[in-house]
């Protein structure tokens, strides 16, 4: 019965970008400016999202799809569909109630967002620290101390991996 009724429903013929206008004998009318319908058979069009304030327009609204926002420089998106913007910090910092704060010793953050995470504990894998960690970078683990016995080949990291002022342990 439901299927039969939907086949007879004139609104089901209205494509995306239009709505079924009850005030005009259920004919398909185009969505008004600043509104859209992303599926067919809609009885109303939805208002387009406006990217204001800290939000920037990433994709303009069209008659068939909503606008998409991202965040102004210095901020990043949070939430589904970028529902919020959160300020960036520098690498080596995390955002707290008191603003951007440096990572505590023994932790690092290599991004402009997120929290400081503990350095890898190389000894848990039976390895040694090859390059010390910093606020911005995790430690680099090398071969286990046993592997570095005389005659064993040592692993040298590529030059860019070395942090200035930190020598391998």
């Amino acid at each position: 019965f439901e299927r039969t009724r939907s086949l007879q429903d004139p609104c089901s013929n209205c494509p995306a970008g239009t709505f079924c206008d009850n005030n005009r004998n259920q004919i398909c009318s185009p969505c008004p400016p600043n509104s859209f319908s992303s599926a067919g058979g809609q009885r109303t069009c939805d208002i387009c999202r406006q990217c204001k304030g800290v939000f920037r327009t990433r994709k303009e609204c069209s008659s068939t799809s909503n606008a998409e926002c991202d965040c102004t420089p210095g901020f990043h998106c949070l939430g589904a569909g970028c529902s919020m913007c959160e300020q960036d910090c520098k690498q080596g910092q995390e955002l707290t109630k008191k603003g951007c704060k440096d990572c505590c010793f023994g932790t690092f953050n290599d991004q402009k967002r997120g929290i400081c995470r503990p350095w890898t504990n190389c000894s848990l894998d039976g390895k040694s620290v090859l390059v010390n960690g910093t606020k911005e970078r995790d430690v680099v683990c090398g071969p286990s101390p046993a592997d570095l016995s005389p005659g064993a080949s040592s692993v040298t990291p590529p030059a860019p991996a070395r942090e200035p002022g930190h020598s391998p342990q």
């Epitope: 800290v54 529902s83 919020m84 959160e86 300020q87 955002l95």
Partner: nanobody
Framework: EVQLVESGGGLVQPGGSLRLSCAAS????????MTWFRQAPGKGLEWVAH????????YYVDSVKGRFTISRDNAKNSLYLQMNSLRAEDTAVYYC????????????????WGQGTTVTVSS
């Protein structure tokens, strides 16, 4: 419609004071952290201060500590920023913003902004 409207900006001499206001409407003001940001000419947005829903927690960027005071009146749906001992480097457009759901628990995202009010500190 959810709206934030700032006022109170103007021209003031170094060492002077101003009080900025932000009138909120269209949402339950008392359920949100509120934040002040500023943008100096040619620079990016900078967080200035924020205040917990009931006003029990307040935090400031180091450069304004001891000079600026954030406050709110939930009965009047209003946010304030009292700015004393103003300096030339405080010259900026000041924006109030609403903390999004979960603000300060898992993140510090904001979702609604005002149009801004201009503060110029100059002799």
């Amino acid at each position: 419609e959810v709206q934030l409207v700032e006022s109170g900006g103007g021209l003031v001499q170094p060492g002077g004071s101003l009080r900025l206001s932000c009138a909120a409407s269209g949402f339950t003001f008392s359920s949100h952290w509120m934040t002040w940001f500023r943008q100096a000419p040619g620079k990016g947005l900078e967080w200035v201060a924020h205040i917990k829903e009931g006003g029990s927690e307040k935090y400031y960027v180091d450069s304004v500590k001891g000079r600026f005071t954030i406050s709110r009146d939930n009965a009047k749906n209003s946010l304030y920023l009292q700015m004393n001992s103003l300096r030339a480097e405080d010259t900026a457009v000041y924006y109030c913003a609403r903390g999004g759901d979960g603000y300060s628990d898992s993140h510090f995202g904001v979702d609604v902004w005002g149009q801004g009010t201009t503060v110029t500190v100059s002799s």
